[in-house]
Amino acid sequence: SGVFQLQLQEFINERGVLASGRPCEPGCRTFFRVCLKHFQAVVSPGPCTFGTVSTPVLGTNSFAVRDDSSGGGRNPLQLPFNFTWPGTFSLIIEAWHAPGDDLRPEALPPDALISKIAIQGSLAVGQNWLLDEQTSTLTRLRYSYRVICSDNYYGDNCSRLCKKRNDHFGHYVCQPDGNLSCLPGWTGEYCQQPICLSGCHEQNGYCSKPAECLCRPGWQGRLCNECIPHNGCRHGTCSTPWQCTCDEGWGGLFCDQDLNYCTHHSPCKNGATCSNSGQRSYTCTCRPGYTGVDCELELSECDSNPCRNGGSCKDQEDGYHCLCPPGYYGLHCEHSTLSCADSPCFNGGSCRERNQGANYACECPPNFTGSNCEKKVDRCTSNPCANGGQCLNRGPSRMCRCRPGFTGTYCELHVSDCARNPCAHGGTCHDLENGLMCTCPAGFSGRRCEVRTSIDACASSPCFNRATCYTDLSTDTFVCNCPYGFVGSRCEFPVGLPPSFPW
């Protein structure tokens, strides 16, 4: 679809005569008829296959034609066509004299024709005007013409329909050749496909508008290139969605079980030594002068029993003071003014002279200590039991009472709940975080496979010849009650004729 445009520029008829040579009265009031048709080697009369157009009276005798496209749109003349432009044409331009106001062909005398020109040739679609001038013996016509495509039609033949759009069906403008030119941010044959945010992962991301990056399930991040780990995954990562691969020092399905509490939390205070003792568990070994689970509390100065030889300790603002018993002196009552003659050793301790009798030393029996064997040994003061074990003094020794799940002299070993073979009747034991689980063999059930569940031995119909089957519950075997005429453990032999022998 397009328009053949004809711009009339100047008509010269100096003598003001008709084609017959007769002069116009009072002058030639001139209008034009245009016929556009298919290419003919010799332009002949006949239907104007591409269209016709007439002008009003444009002037008298000789005149220039104003460009009137802005006004009524009469010049250039428009000859629209609704087909593919063939690239060739024939054009007939007739100049007529209008004696009156009626310009219809049937209202004009046949000799009102002033001049007629006919041209034919090739014409490509384009914006450029072709200037032409046709001269006869009495007249001259200067004009220009071109073919342009109608709105939304493009290409060499105006055959390519292209209407710019920016909606769900496409986002484009049209190139001169009719091809689509996508608006920024759109791509695809019809510019329907948004161009996602630069770097948006091809598989894991998508977009519904340009510069967007929406993530498919299981993916996250600005570019949808980070997998989403398993819901609840605490200290783990993923390489594909919904995984939970634990970071070092963490365990469990959700990587929430702290296998290295000491490193992750540094719970021990005041220079104490931290030891991991199982999942989310630890033990702090305090430096002297500190106490508490995390060694977070100082001991009162007297709590370390600094006074020797039965001296009594008194806390003071700036430390402590030892009140020494008779016969002793020094900061910690460590110096003695006694000798073995004074029987200074208590609780059956034996006295040994030292420094030529100026001093002595007590050798204490088991369970007693101190310079004078005055202190009963408390073997639990060093808190030797690990994992929350309770320390008990037992005469000359000590023992640890362990919490469930721990064993060893100092409760330092983690007990496998399955170690004591708790599953009966050949059940398989599985250690769990909070206990154990037994998988029972056929015929047994219960938490420890301790319950015998009866197996129906008759289920396989082992008895023949309509015998009745009974299950022996004590042995899980069957017994067949034979009908008359049959014997055997399965009632498989008929009774009657004795077996025949071959001899």
Epitope: H265, P267, R280, S281, Y282, T283, T291, G292, V293, D294, E296, L297, E298, L299, S300, E301, D303, D315, Q316, E317, D318, G319, G388, R403
Partner: antibody
Framework: QVQLQESGPGLVKPSQTLSLTCTVS??????????WTWIRQHPGRGLEWIGY???????HYNPSLKSRVTMSVDTSKNQFSLKMTSVTDADTAVYYC???????????WGRGTMVTVSS | DVVMTQSPGTLFLSPGERATLSCRAS???????LAWYQQKPGQAPRLLIY???SRATGIPDRFSGSGSGTDFTLNISRLEPEDFALYYC?????????FGQGTRLEIK
């Protein structure tokens, strides 16, 4: 916000064992570096620290009560407990559970439960 | 044990006045591990100050604490009617943790 609630019998016979439980709500007993503590207040008198337990089950007690006191923790129920053996009328008091976050200043307290030791 | 001694035993003041409560430790309390609590009849104690001078969450700025070593003070700049209660100091530097015997603040 975080709340603590003590529960247990209000009357215990002499020489028997006092058992109390503290239920923690709006906070996991396993989270943070909290010391879950028991404190008591004798009628008309001051406050006495009994001891604390951590979620790991490790506890630290007042040396004056150590021989009679045991604390335990049940993370699945979000509770911690106090057991005191061989009680006498000197153990009659209001017993409070409290939270100490990171150090031993007690920012959250239970309402307290009165325990009377009497035959 | 670290003995905490509070003075005075009872303090009589009027609303709008300034209150100064003292607490002395029998041994040095390191790192200012000292707290102050307020207790009203039938209620549990409420933490006011920790670390000798840091106000607990939600405590009005009229309450302030100071001191180090063995001598500590709780100041209430302008007494409100609801401030008349029992106040305890507590050390948490040494084991066992110990409280003062309390100072009762009463309306004059």
């Amino acid at each position: 916000q975080v709340q603590l609630q003590e529960s247990g019998p209000g009357l215990v016979k002499p020489s028997q064992t006092l058992s109390l439980t503290c239920t923690v709500s709006s906070d996991s007993i396993s989270s943070g570096n909290n010391y879950w503590t028991w404190i008591r207040q004798h009628p008309g008198r001051g406050l006495e620290w009994i001891g604390y337990i951590k979620y790991t089950g490790s506890a630290h007690y007042n040396p004056s009560l150590k021989s009679r006191v045991t604390m335990s923790v049940d993370t699945s129920k979000n509770q911690f407990s106090l057991k005191m053996t061989s009680v006498t009328d000197a153990d009659t008091a209001v017993y409070y559970c409290a939270r100490a976050p990171g150090s031993h200043s007690f920012d959250i307290w239970g309402r307290g439960t009165m325990v009377t030791v009497s035959s | 044990d670290v003995v905490m001694t509070q003075s005075p035993g009872t303090l009589f003041l009027s609303p709008g006045e300034r209150a100064t409560l003292s607490c002395r430790a029998s041994q040095s309390v390191s790192s200012s591990y000292l707290a102050w609590y307020q207790q009203k009849p039938g209620q549990a104690p409420r933490l006011l100050i920790y670390g000798a001078s840091s106000r607990a969450t939600g405590i009005p700025d009229r309450f302030s604490g100071s001191g180090s070593g063995t001598d500590f003070t709780l100041n209430i700049s302008r007494l409100e009617p609801e401030d008349f209660a029992l106040y305890y100091c507590q050390q948490y530097s040494r084991s066992p943790i110990t409280f003062g015997q309390g100072t009762r603040l009463e309306i004059k």
